[in-house]
């Protein structure tokens, strides 16, 4: 899918209204410098395009993030303010239904949201300096 | 852990040509800025150039503009530069290194390479 | 092309306090990041966005930047940050990556 169409400005605001809250509250009992980042992203639709990709893509050792409060918050803001985001994931969420749900947050996992808070740290920043 | 290695490196003669390359690992490499930057010896640090994420910007520095092509292949995590019509003061320490990108704004250089040794001479 | 002038040395009484100046014009409208470098290893980033520091770095090192002038500023000088200084930042209107002349830090 491509997020150059997207209405950034309000995706910020639910971010930051909701699902900020949901990604720390996941984090909670972890240090900002327990994990390195190695994910990075460099203008906002590319922002989206990773954040989708950690939040969405089961990965071997953390398969369960979709199913989580802040991936459900995700995919409905990007449903509603990104247009025709919808009908591109009919596919992935039948496919997402036929795994089992992991219920243990493993350390993997945590890394991976660690990345996804950089992520939408960096789409919700503007340079203070153009140079 | 996150690590960029570099190879290539050796002893050429002045006109001849060399390809350097840098092998990333421990970060998604497609979602970088790819810089080189050189060290002649005893002397400063003096960038050569950069490729952005997704390979669509490069910029050289004006002393290997023409000479230097700087490519990246994300499927293999790996950075190449391609040096042609080497020259005497083109001998340095080749370091690969990697910045954040935003738009067109390269920011600070926080993974280096250990770096490769380029020595042009007849 | 952008020019950024570092002086070529500074030296440090072990305990005190160094302060490695970095020139350019207007630089303080650019994002200036520093480097260490030791003698025969790769440069490491010590500060970046000016003042920020990366999580591995002591929080003896700061800096910052206004008008003319950016600052790296060492406190509590020990002998292990005896290396090469370098500022840095990146020149958008050549599209260039530009390194200050490196300043060599003595901790006497």
């Known amino acids: 899918y491509d997020f150059t169409n997207c209405d950034f400005q309000k995706i910020e605001a639910d971010y930051l209204r909701t699902i900020s809250k949901d990604l720390i509250t996941y984090m909670s009992g972890t240090k900002s410098t327990d994990f390195n980042n190695t994910v990075s992203c460099s203008n906002r639709p590319h922002c989206l395009t990773e954040i989708q990709s950690l939040t969405f893509n089961p990965t071997p050792r953390c398969a369960s993030l979709a199913k989580e409060m802040f991936a459900r918050k995700t995919k409905a803001t990007l449903a509603l303010w990104c247009p025709g985001y919808s009908e591109t994931q009919i596919n992935a969420t039948q496919a997402m239904k036929k795994r089992r749900k992991r219920k243990v947050t493993t350390n993997k996992c945590l890394e991976q949201v660690s990345q996804l808070l950089g992520l939408w740290r960096r789409f919700i920043r503007t340079l203070l300096k153009k140079q | 852990q996150m690590q960029l290695v570099e190879s290539g490196g050796g002893v050429v003669q002045p006109g001849r040509s060399l390809r350097l390359s840098c092998a990333a690992s421990?970060?998604?490499?497609?979602?970088?800025?790819m810089h080189w930057v050189r060290q002649a010896p005893g002397k400063g640090l003096e960038w050569v150039a950069v490729?952005?994420?997704?390979?669509?910007?490069?910029h050289y520095a004006d002393s290997v503009k023409g000479r230097f092509t700087i490519t990246r292949d994300n499927s293999k995590n790996t950075l190449n530069l391609q040096m042609n019509s080497l020259r005497a003061e083109d001998t340095a320490v080749y370091y690969c290194?990697?910045?954040?990108?935003?738009?067109?704004?390269?920011?600070?250089?926080?993974?280096w390479g250990q770096g490769t040794m380029v020595t042009v001479s007849s | 092309s952008y020019v950024l002038t570092q002086p070529p040395s500074v030296s440090v009484a072990p305990g005190q306090t160094a302060r490695i100046t970095c020139g350019g014009n207007n630089i303080g409208s650019f994002s200036v990041h520093w480097y260490q470098q030791k003698p025969g290893q790769a440069p490491v980033l010590v500060v970046y966005d000016d003042s920020d520091r990366p999580s591995w770095i002591p929080e003896r090192f700061s800096g910052s930047n206004s008008g003319n002038t950016a600052t790296l500023t060492i406190s509590r000088g020990e002998a292990g940050d005896e290396a090469d200084y370098y500022c840095?930042?990146?020149?958008?209107?050549?599209?260039?990556?530009?390194f200050g002349g490196g300043t060599k830090l003595t901790v006497l």
């Open positions: 290194t990697r910045s954040p990108q935003w738009e067109e704004v390269y920011e600070a250089l926080d993974i």
């Open positions: 840095q930042v990146w020149s958008s209107t050549s599209r260039h990556v530009v």
């Open positions: 421990g970060f998604t490499f497609r979602t970088y800025g």
């Open positions: 490729i952005s994420y997704s390979g669509s910007y490069i």
